[in-house]
Amino acid sequence: VLEVYYTHLRCRCVQESSVFIPRRFIDRIQISPRGNGCPRKEIIVWKKNKSVVCVDPQAEWIQRIMEMLRKKSSSTPPVPVFKRKIP
C-alpha cells in the first residue's frame, strides 16, 4: 500500500537508504511531498518486521516504482481525498 500525506511540519528523515527492498518485506510506503516545513520530498517505508526506513527519492528502485504508479494512476480517475492510498 502506498500512502501520500500532505501535512508534515518538519523533515523526519535523517538518514536515507538507496537499497532495493523486496515487496514482500514492505508493509506500506509513505510519500511526503516537499513543503510544510520540510524542503525536500521524503519517502518512508514501513517494513513488516516493524522497522522503518527512509528511502532516497533519487534511488533508482523507488523511482522505477513511482513511475509504475504514475502510469497506473494516470489510467484511473484521481481520488479526491486528503490521504491517497494506492494498492
Epitope: S18, V19, F20, I21, P22, R23, R24, F25, W61, I65
Partner: antibody
Amino acid sequence: EVQLVESGGGLVQPGGSLRLSCAASGIDFSRYWMSWVRQAPGKGLEWVAEINPESSTINYAPSLKDRFTISRDNAKNSLYLQMNSLRAEDTAVYYCARQDDYEYYAMDYWGQGTTVTVSS
Amino acid sequence: DIQMTQSPSSLSASVGDRVTITCKASQDVNTGVAWYQQKPGKAPKLLIYSASYRYTGVPSRFSGSGSGTDFTFTISSVQPEDIATYYCQQYYSTPLTFGGGTKLEIK
C-alpha cells in the same frame, strides 16, 4: 561470529523421508527470514523455500511445495526442512541461509551445507 | 517464475584482466539482484546486493550494475583467489531464482 550449521543429511532410498536441521548461533535468529537452497552435484544453486520469523509467511519453489515443508523453532534457534517422497533428483547439498530483511535483503549468511543422497 | 539467464557459463582470464558476466531476467526485477561467489566445496558468499552495492568486506575490484532486466557483474582486475563460480540471483519476488553460474578459471 555468525554460524549456521546444517545436519540430518545422509543416504535415503527413493520414496523415503528426511528431516534436515540448521542450528543458528551468533545472530538473533528469531528476527530473520531464513531460506533453504540446494545444489545438485556439478549443478547450480536452486532455491527451495523461505520462512519469515513468525512462521506466518512461507514460500516454496513451485516444483517442491507438495513434498517439502520448511519450519522453524525460534526457542531452539533452529530451522528445519522436512523432505518426503524423495527422488533421485533431490540428491544435493542443502544449505540454510539467512535472508536479511533489515539492510541487504539478500542471503548474507550461509551454512556449510549437508549432503542428501537419494539412491537405492 | 522469473528466469535468470547468465552468460558466459565459463571463462578463462589472466591475472589482472577485467572480466564481465551478464545476467538477463525474463521480466523486470527492478534492482533486486544479488551476485554470489562460490569456491569449490564451499558455501556461496554474498558479493553484491541491490544490483550495485558491495557487501561488507568485499574488495572494490568487484562491482555490479543494471536494473530492470539487464545486469552486469565485473571484476576489474582478476586475482588468483577469484577462481570460483559466480551466480546472479533475483530476489525481487518468489520463487527466488539463480542464474546458471559462470565458472572463472585463471589462464
